[in-house]
Interface confidence: low
């Protein structure tokens, strides 16, 4: 299953399949997730090692047992690939690294006013993979405000150096934020020229395109079909690039198919997995296991559950079957693609779904970096779990926020439904940033069931929590995916990086905001909070957040929305915006329902009819 824990001061010994430089452990984990053989990783921060060559070293590892011996190494961080982790799987990495220069091939230099502008330029350049920005205080005046766009053969920096007044980061193309746009067309009987960056075997052009999309240097591809004239070249998928970013020429050629990477698509990227099953096809590779199962779908599920399995063949040969079960061959290769593809067989083949991010399990999401008073505008995909709860009586209006916690579940505040318990007046909008973007044609979810905590009473602050079951499950995308729930009774974790988001008022007597707002707010102890609210009982089932001096807070319209905290690179839903005395007043923190205290209730209510929990806490 999905293992999200990180091991500090530990290094996995042996099992190396690749190494690279990455700015932090989270990026290293992402590279491990997308590497076909990587199950474990170890990362060496700059502070952990004197050897300059190994600083920022990211070591990707494989193990037939799924684990490796851990040795103590001060400062090192190790962990697991996020294969099988559903919606946590994303190549999107938004972080900016201060005081770090990520080296690569510098192919473009320009003057810009901020690191955000530099990141935007990188995201809008087809060849840019990462960038470095020299700030206004950089020691050499002529380099100040320089934005260097970079690439490298592997898509990761060729070296990372500690350098004052330099900030670095990655292109946000994998976040589906590129302004370039993409070519969805597939060109039959056409071969593209230019440089081949890799070759793999695929059963069709669509798998070839997905592999191209997630390959660091592939911009376009040519696929040779299974009836291509040269037998040894059949099913070859050539991943290609060029200096200009587009094919310099194309040749009409029977039985070839060409197309483009979809990495530059805006708002939607293909999933990094291949779900189609290919009847009459055998996939060759290294044998991992052979098991008897009933049906090709069970074979695919078996492959998906066995983390090292990359693809499979289900044989229907009489000698491979007994009763209703037939042999399911679980296989792998060095590059994640079959080493041989044979047609006209009595088998059916396909791929593991371990990198699909629409899996049933709602495990924690780690990927993504509130009107809120004193807040700032959010950007696309920054808070993909945030939803807007709107009421349509006569005019439609935003009333509350909420958090997506599963394909069919939203967590919000009970008081949002005071006087409005009718489920058919509510519309739930997910995957949006600007309320003004909502038109009559914008898709929304309807409510199947409102589950208000049984101990909640109107006009009381206690047990201010409610679950919404949606009529239809939502698909996960970079802009619409769930937030991780905390562990039951989570009291030991000290959260230092917490944010509240919402479209609520920007001042006490204000109005709903158009752009989703965010504000960074520190947590306050319950003892401190109780001192500020002597007329109310601050219980252990509440959590408070706010600045002593005020100025930043949630406000009307933010209710029900998330208070999220980032810990070990993972976002968790710590609180639900509930109540407070006014908004952003001095020494009057906001009060939030403490989600960890309600985990039993949430899990009980979200049990599906077949008895499996729809939600899952971090491992």
């Amino acid at each position: 299953g999905c293992l999200t824990q990180l091991y500090e001061n530990a290094f996995f010994r042996g099992g190396d399949v690749a190494s690279m430089y990455t700015p932090n452990a989270q990026y290293c984990q992402m590279r491990c997730t997308f590497h076909p053989r990587c199950l474990l990783f170890s990362f060496l921060p700059a502070s952990s090692i004197n050897d300059m060559e190994k600083r920022f070293g990211c070591f990707l590892k494989d193990s037939v047992t799924g684990t490796l011996p851990k040795v103590h190494r001060t400062g090192a961080v190790s962990g697991h690939s996020l294969k099988q982790c559903g919606h946590q799987i994303s190549a999107c990495h938004r972080d900016i690294y201060k005081g770090v220069d990520m080296r690569g091939v510098n192919f473009n230099v320009s003057k810009v006013s901020s690191v955000e502008e530099c990141q935007k330029r990188c995201t809008s350049n087809i060849r840019c993979q990462f960038f470095s920005y020299a700030t206004q205080t950089f020691h050499k005046a002529e380099y100040r405000n320089n934005c260097l766009l970079k690439y490298s053969p592997g898509g990761t920096p060729t070296a990372i150096k500690v350098l004052s007044n330099v900030e670095s980061g990655f292109s946000l193309k994998p976040c589906a934020l590129s302004e370039i746009g993409c070519h969805m067309n597939i060109f039959q009987h056409l071969a593209f020229s230019d440089v081949d960056v890799a070759r793999v075997l695929t059963p069709d052009a669509f798998v070839c395109r997905t592999i191209c999309t997630y390959h660091p240097n592939c911009l376009f591809f040519t696929f040779y079909t299974n009836v291509w004239k040269i037998e040894s070249q059949r099913n070859v998928c050539l991943l290609k690039t060029s200096e200009s970013g587009t094919p310099s020429s194309s040749t009409p050629q029977e039985n070839t198919i060409s197309g483009y990477s979809l990495l530059t698509c805006k708002r939607t990227l293909p999933e990094p997995c291949h779900s189609k099953i290919y009847p009459g096809v055998d996939f060759g590779g290294e044998e991992l296991n052979v098991t008897f199962v009933k049906g090709v779908n069970v074979c695919q599920e078996t492959c998906t559950k066995m983390i090292r399995c990359q693809f499979f063949t289900y044989s229907l040969l009489p000698e491979d079957c007994k009763e209703e079960k037939c042999k399911c061959f679980l296989r792998l290769s060095m590059d994640g693609s079959p080493t041989r593809i044979a047609y006209g067989t009595q088998g059916s083949s396909g791929y593991s779904l371990r990198l699909c991010n629409t899996g049933d399990n709602s495990v924690c999401t780690t990927k993504t970096s509130t009107r809120i008073v004193g807040g700032t505008n959010s950007s696309w995909g920054e808070w993909p779990w945030q939803v807007s709860l709107q009421v349509k009586l006569t005019a439609q209006r935003h009333l509350c926020g909420g958090s997506l916690i599963g394909h069919q579940w939203v967590l919000t505040a009970a008081h949002c439904f005071d006087g409005l318990p009718l489920q058919d007046v509510w519309r739930i909008y997910s995957g949006i940033l600007n309320l003004s973007d909502i038109t009559k044609d914008t898709p929304f979810s309807q409510i199947k069931e409102i589950i208000i905590h049984q101990n909640y009473k109107v006009s009381e602050g206690n047990h201010d929590i409610a679950l919404i079951k949606l009529q239809a499950p939502l698909n996960y995308t970079e802009f619409q995916k769930p937030i991780c729930l905390p562990s039951k009774g989570d009291t030991s974790t000290i959260y230092t990086n917490c944010w509240v988001t919402g479209w609520g008022f920007s001042k006490e007597k204000g109005e709903i905001q158009n752009i989703l707002q965010k504000v960074n707010i520190p947590l306050v102890t319950n003892e401190e909070c109780q001192k500020r609210y002597q007329d109310y009982k601050i219980t252990q089932r509440m959590v408070c957040a706010g600045y002593k001096e005020g100025g930043k807070d949630a406000c009307k319209g933010d209710s029900g929305g998330p208070l999220v905290c980032k810990h070990n690179g993972m976002w968790r839903l710590v609180g639900i915006t509930s109540w407070g005395e006014g908004c952003a007043r001095r020494e009057q923190p906001g009060v939030y329902t403490k989600v960890a205290e309600y985990m039993d209730w949430i899990l009980e209510k979200t049990q599906s009819s077949d008895g499996k929990a729809q939600m899952q806490s971090p491992a």
Epitope: D194, A198, R199, Y224, I230, Q233, V236, S248
Partner: antibody, heavy 118, light 107 residues
Framework: EVQLLESGGGLVQPGGSLRLSCAAS????????MNWVRQAPGKGLEWVSS????????TYADSVKGRFTISRDNSKNTLYLQMNSLRAEDTAVYYC???????????WGQGTLVTVSS | DIQMTQSPSSLSAFVGDRVSITCRAS??????VNWYQHKSGQAPKLLIY???SLQSGVPSRFSGSGSGTDFTLTISSLQPEDFATYFC?????????FGGGTDVQIR
């Protein structure tokens, strides 16, 4: 029968130029990427340059980048290598080779000797 | 660039011997390795492509194996005409690179 025949080699002074040709026959020349590979006396094989089937894209080894130019004329079934600013270390037998889909060189010419010496 | 390290650099063997030559890539390259035979004054000849596929017209005593970083060319029963220099080459990425060569001599 596939045949590749190189020509144009010879003795040249450092800093001089030469143009190698490779005449192809026995296959549809315009469908295959082509390459130049060289072997210096007593040394191993070194890839020099490649050109796509249409001639639209070219790549070079770092050691010759900016000095050598690969080109092809599909109407004449001929591959070329223009070598400028020649150096003593460019002395080698130069082979033209056809590239099959997996990047192997399935047919080679007999080679032409280029000697750069004063 | 991907380095291809070939060993041994030379070997001497009897006719009928089984001979193996290895090639190690500096990074993982799937199965994109090709093997060539080169005799002095002649054009090199492709023996094996894609690590293990036998080029048409090449005798079946030649075989290739390996994937990732380690590759082997095996001649199951050495014949007089097999005495030559053998090269491996990676075609995983540009620039294409060759191993240093193995000189197979008659003992």
């Amino acid at each position: 029968e596939v045949q590749l025949l190189e020509s144009g080699g010879g003795l040249v002074q450092p800093g001089g130029s030469l143009r190698l040709s490779c005449a192809a026959s026995g296959f549809t020349f315009s469908q295959y990427p082509m390459n130049w590979v060289r072997q210096a006396p007593g040394k191993g094989l070194e890839w020099v340059s490649s050109i796509s089937s249409s001639g639209g894209f070219t790549t070079y080894a770092d050691s010759v980048k900016g000095r050598f130019t690969i080109s092809r004329d599909n109407s004449k079934n001929t591959l070329y290598l223009q070598m400028n600013s020649l150096r003593a270390e460019d002395t080698a037998v130069y082979y033209c080779a056809r590239e099959e889909q997996q990047g192997g060189f399935d047919y080679w010419g007999q080679g032409t000797l280029v000697t750069v010496s004063s | 660039d991907i380095q291809m390290t070939q060993s041994p650099s030379s070997l001497s063997a009897f006719v009928g011997d089984r001979v193996s030559i290895t090639c190690r890539a500096s990074q993982t390259i799937s199965v994109y390795v090709n093997w060539y035979q080169h005799k002095s004054g002649q054009a090199p000849k492709l023996l094996i492509y894609g690590a293990s596929s036998l080029q048409s017209g090449v005798p079946s005593r030649f075989s290739g194996s390996g994937s990732g970083t380690d590759f082997t060319l095996t001649i199951s029963s050495l014949q007089p005409e097999d005495f030559a220099t053998y090269f491996c080459q990676q075609s995983y990425s540009i620039p294409f690179t060759f191993g240093g060569g193995t000189d197979v001599q008659i003992r």
